[in-house]
């Protein structure tokens, strides 16, 4: 048997081209110079290498760059990026947004993989914060990206970046995340007029406190029920029937359909039945007439 470690005569690769697709895996390993591969990475994507052949090429790069690939190589990885492990990516130092875009393009249409999550984490940490351009790019590729961040990570998002956020980017955010994002959105949109402000702030309202909801109720915003149902229960409970009526405008009729669900159910339990009756919706479960309501939390605070 021929020892298959030395490149056969005449097979040494002079450039990365189509002729390599019929090289055996061991021939690729023996005949393709890693430095040549690194300088011609952009050609690899145009060549229909098999999955196994790509592994050989990756192995060659790993040997050439044991401490991690330089950005000049990373930017042109193309489909070879799909072969990288999170451990590989942790060795990288990616600073260019163009590099990030190039790699996200490769994964386009797929779920966010552990590789992509690691890449984004490395990139954002390198930049120190989630600036607007980065956020724009990330949410364009992964609408749910913001909601995958912890409240701590979200705290590094500057208010200016909030302009890049679309309503669908917040679909999977939980209340803790919206608690962090809402004050930033409020700051970002503070100079807008009433109706425009509401359009922009609406998707962030799951993090709004009671006093902001009260303020909105004075502005004829006509909040839809879907938005109302996403509000924090503790922020909705102190609202009066009149304030909810003003907040929802013509959408107030939708309360009937949601009377068994939070936060509507809990809010109903806190209202006087007389006040609920003024809505004419047949909402039941309020405090009967003549009952005294004690705010125990206030009493505890005083004692």
């Amino acid at each position: 048997e021929v020892e298959k470690t030395a490149c056969p005569s005449g097979k040494k690769a002079r450039e990365i081209d189509e002729s390599l697709i019929f090289y055996k895996k061991w021939e690729l390993e023996a005949c393709v110079d890693a430095a040549l591969l690194a300088t011609q990475m952009d050609r690899v994507n145009a060549i229909p290498f098999t999955y196994e052949q790509l592994d050989v090429l990756k192995h060659k790069l790993d040997e050439l760059y044991p401490q991690g690939y330089p950005e000049s190589v990373i930017q042109h990885l193309g489909y070879l990026f799909l072969k990288m492990s999170p451990e590989d990516i942790r060795k990288w130092n990616v600073t260019s947004l163009e590099t990030l875009k190039a790699l996200l393009e490769v994964n386009k249409g797929h779920e966010m993989s552990p590789q992509v999550a690691t890449l984004i984490d490395r990139f954002v940490k390198g930049r120190g914060q989630l600036d607007k351009d980065t956020l724009d790019t990330l949410t364009a590729f992964y609408p749910g990206y913001l909601c995958s961040l912890s409240p701590e990570e979200l705290s590094s998002v500057p208010p200016s970046s909030i302009w890049a956020v679309r309503p669908q980017d917040l679909d999977t955010c939980d209340p803790r995340q919206l608690d962090v994002l809402y004050p930033k959105a409020r700051l970002a949109f503070q100079n807008m007029n009433g109706s425009e402000y509401f359009v922009k702030i609406q998707s962030f309202l799951g993090g709004a406190p009671t006093e902001d909801l009260k303020a909105l109720s004075q502005q004829n915003v006509s909040m839809d029920l879907a938005t109302f149902m996403k509000l924090r229960t503790d922020a909705v409970l102190p609202l009066t029937v009149a304030e909810v009526q003003k907040l929802l405008g013509p959408h107030v009729e939708g309360l009937k359909a949601e009377e068994r669900h939070r936060p509507v159910r809990d809010w109903i339990l806190r209202q006087r039945q007389d006040d609920l009756d003024t809505l004419g919706l047949g909402l039941q479960g309020g405090i009967p007439n003549g009952y005294l309501v004690l705010d125990l939390s206030m009493q505890e605070a005083l004692s």
């Epitope: 048997e1 895996k25 061991w26 021939e27 390993e29 098999t50 050989v56």
Partner: antibody
């Protein structure tokens, strides 16, 4: 003289798991690819997958997710972990070495072990 | 997906006959093809690699040819020990394929 000996076969219930081992001698796992192939009674050879010298693994489309190939170079042993076994997984399981010392499956399998029988039945 | 088709699935022949077995790939695999011989109760035996190169210790009556999609295994003069099942195997792409082997050709005594 290169030798391969499979072990770990036997009777297993549907839904169960089994780990087959292939002990090798006469060569180094860090220089050769190792594969697993099975053959149901009276049927064709069926490729399961292989592991290259550098540890990258490749599988038949039907085996992905249920079957896992691994190796321990220091123990000169290759493994086939099989999960969620079904009656149709009943077969003789062969381990085989890549014939080429290049360390990938480039030329074929040679030599082969004698095989170990796996029966999946309740 | 890359598939291998062998024909015929079985054939009968006499000692001394010239026997030809065909194997077709669903796409071009260059010369990345191996042939095996298997007898009942035994593991396969490696015969040919790179479509036409004889493995060590294989008698010269066995030969292989072909490139691209169509391949042939020929036994020039069938011997008693050659009655067995023969399989082809593509080694071009071994990842995420249904099977790298053809389904075999059984050679029996006429």
């Amino acid at each position: 003289q290169s030798q391969l000996v499979e072990s770990g076969g036997g009777l297993v219930q549907p839904g169960g798991s089994l780990r087959l081992s292939c002990a090798v001698s006469g060569f180094s796992l860090s220089s050769y690819a190792m594969g697993w192939v099975r053959q149901a009674p009276g049927k064709c050879l069926e490729y399961i997958g292989y592991i290259s010298k550098i540890g990258t693994t490749y599988y038949a489309s039907w085996a992905k997710g249920r079957f896992t190939i691994s190796k321990d170079n220091s123990k000169n042993t290759v493994y086939l972990q099989m999960n969620s076994l079904r009656a149709e997984d009943t077969a003789v399981y062969f381990c085989a070495r890549g014939s080429s010392s290049g360390g990938y499956l480039d030329d074929g399998f040679d030599p082969w072990g004698q095989g170990t029988l796996v029966t999946v039945s309740s | 997906a890359l598939q291998m088709t062998q024909s015929p699935s079985s054939l009968s022949a006499r000692v001394g006959d010239r026997v030809t077995i065909k194997c077709q790939a669903s796409q071009s695999i260059s010369n990345y093809l191996a042939w095996y011989q298997q007898k009942p109760g035994k593991p396969p035996k490696f015969l040919i690699y790179d479509a036409s190169d004889l493995a060590s210790g294989v008698p010269s009556r066995f030969s292989g040819s072909g490139s691209g999609r169509d391949f042939t295994l020929t036994i020039s003069s069938l011997q008693p020990e050659d009655f067995a099942t023969y399989y082809c195997q593509q080694v071009y792409d071994s990842n995420n394929v249904e099977n790298v082997f053809g389904c075999g050709t059984k050679v029996t005594v006429l």
